[in-house]
Interface confidence: low
């Protein structure tokens, strides 16, 4: 009853000329131990002789005969469980069907295993996740349907022809279910890896090239932008014009929308790659950037700090402190919005210019009654002189003087 024989092994094994084949195999013959084993190459049943014809690669009988010329073939099994085989080296003409002719005391069985031997080392296969996004860790897998104890190999990862620094984990399987060598590489791609070539290279133990597989990375990423401004230093005067240009240096997938932001807030009706600011005012000073979006999300350029220069505005005076007690100290501060900052100040006391006072602050260490009155100032920068503001009143408190009795 032939159904008593149960085998487990890979359906097809792959190798190349000069390498080797390790065939993991288990069996169960329910009626007793194995008495005879013959390994055929492309066996064919001969009805006349009721026997199998074909090249005998290996023969092990009760007499213990082994074909002397087939030392490269080894039966590594036993009489009741293991039918593992090794062919080393394996040759191109070994391709085809291997037939394991098993005989016990009362039963016979022919088990067939496919062997595919190529002329040259066949390439591994790179497996990528369905989508790769920038900065998200992915696992790249390189799979080769080959592994053999007598022929060590290695899989190396290359990016644009340069070995990748990330540590790869290589695993091998030589089981009755599958035979393979696999290398897995954890990798966090950046947007700049988009379009780059990744290679998995099969090498022998000495690092000699055998074959490879390549893929082009498709890294989804937000748009990468460059902002250019005219004038390049982004410093202008009120009334001048400014042009900012947004350039997309990379986007995957394609970009869909463009917008401009000032101090983090979107500018209305500005959705082209060029931002034209005509006759700028000081209120338009601030940080500008462009934002371009695609299906992954928005990308932002670096910020450009636009400085609109203008002459000083009408100045105000702050007094620390009024009213002041005679003999105390007082400080006056001239405040005026200007860009660039004022470089010169003119101070006035009761409308009359205070000679020698050109600083932002005026300090009077000892206040006297005659210091009371209105203080005002004028600020000046390279663009002009501001207007004198309303000024501030200093009140000086002092004890009675020259008391006379009436």
């Amino acid at each position: 009853d032939s159904s008593k024989w149960v085998f487990e092994h890979p359906e097809t094994l792959y190798a190349w000329e000069g390498a080797c084949v390790w065939i993991p195999c288990t069996y169960r013959a329910l009626d007793g131990d194995l008495e005879s084993f013959i390994l055929f190459h492309n066996p064919e049943y001969n009805k006349n002789t009721s026997k199998f014809d074909g090249t005998r690669l290996y023969e092990s009988t009760k007499d213990g005969k082994v074909p002397s010329e087939q030392k490269r073939v080894q039966f590594l099994g036993d009489k009741n469980k293991n039918c593992t085989l090794s062919i080393h080296p394996v040759h191109l003409n070994d391709s085809g069907q291997l037939g394991l002719r098993m005989e016990s005391k009362t039963e016979k069985w022919m088990e067939r295993i496919h062997l595919n031997v190529s002329e040259r080392p066949f390439p591994p296969h790179i497996q990528l996740p369905p989508e790769i996004q920038e900065s998200q860790e992915v696992t790249l897998t390189c799979l080769l349907n080959f592994s053999c104890y007598g022929y060590p190999i290695q899989l190396q990862w290359l990016l644009e022809g340069v070995p990748m620094r990330q540590a790869a984990v290589t695993s091998t399987s030589l089981t009755i279910k599958s035979v393979f060598t696999r290398s897995e590489l954890k990798f966090s791609p950046q947007w700049s890896h988009h379009g780059k070539i990744v290679t998995c290279q099969l090498q022998d133990a000495d690092g000699k090239f055998l074959s490879n597989d390549t893929v082009q990375l498709n890294v989804k990423h937000t748009p990468k932008l460059e902002i250019k401004v005219t004038p390049s230093d982004a410093i202008v005067r009120e009334g001048d014009s400014v042009t900012m240009t947004c350039e997309v240096s990379s986007s995957n997938p394609e970009y869909t929308t463009v917008s401009w932001l000032k101090d983090g807030t979107s500018l209305k009706k500005q959705n082209t790659f060029t931002l034209n600011l005509r006759e700028v005012t000081k209120d338009q000073s601030g940080k500008y950037c462009c934002q371009v979006s695609n299906d992954v999300g928005p990308g932002r350029s670096e910020e450009v700090f636009l400085q609109v220069q203008y002459a000083p505005e009408p100045s105000t005076v702050q007094i620390l402190h009024s009213p002041a007690v005679e003999g105390s100290q007082v400080e006056f501060l001239c405040m005026s919005l200007a860009n660039p900052l004022p470089t010169n100040y003119t101070w006035y006391h009761n409308g009359k210019e205070m000679q020698g006072r050109t600083e932002e602050k005026v300090h009077i260490p000892k206040i006297l009654p005659w210091h009371a009155g209105t203080y005002s100032c004028v600020a000046e920068n390279i663009l002009g002189t501001g207007q004198r503001g309303p000024g501030a009143e200093l009140d000086v408190q002092y004890p009675p003087k020259k008391v006379t009795t009436v």
Epitope: E247, V248, N252
Partner: nanobody, 121 residues
Framework: QVQLVESGGGLVQAGDSLKLSCLAS????????MSWFRQAPGKEREFVAG????????HHADSVKGRFTISRDNAKSAVYLQMNSLQPEDTAVYFC??????????????WGQGTQVTVSS
């Protein structure tokens, strides 16, 4: 060998129309973002228009918006630039470019040789 071959350029009057074509070979056309650029004498090469791998979205430089339209036919491995209301300032050599990345900058993987467009007033 990758080839991008432009055609359709010529000498026209201001206000006329022209249609430029670019035929690609040696690349998987549908995998590339296709663009048109132009370069006027003594000036830098500038982005004119670009179109996504599937034919959308398309992008046009501000200077040609409303006048020029880019389109592509993946079955023919071709990209087109329909140019209407041509102005003398549109005079330039027009280049077709194939880019793996969608980008408006003058960086491309493959360039055509260019076709001359001259607009007289």
């Amino acid at each position: 060998q990758v080839q991008l071959v432009e055609s359709g350029g010529g000498l026209v009057q201001a206000g006329d129309s022209l249609k430029l074509s670019c035929l690609a070979s040696g690349i998987t056309f549908s995998s590339y973002y296709m663009s048109w650029f132009r370069q006027a004498p003594g000036k830098e090469r500038e982005f004119v228009a670009g179109v996504g791998r599937s034919g959308a979205p398309s992008h046009h430089a501000d200077s040609v918006k409303g006048r020029f339209t880019i389109s592509r036919d993946n079955a023919k491995s071709a990209v087109y630039l329909q140019m209407n209301s041509l102005q003398p300032e549109d005079t330039a050599v027009y280049f077709c470019a194939a880019k793996w990345m969608a980008a408006s900058t003058t960086v491309a993987d493959y360039w055509g040789q260019g076709t001359q467009v001259t607009v007289s007033s």
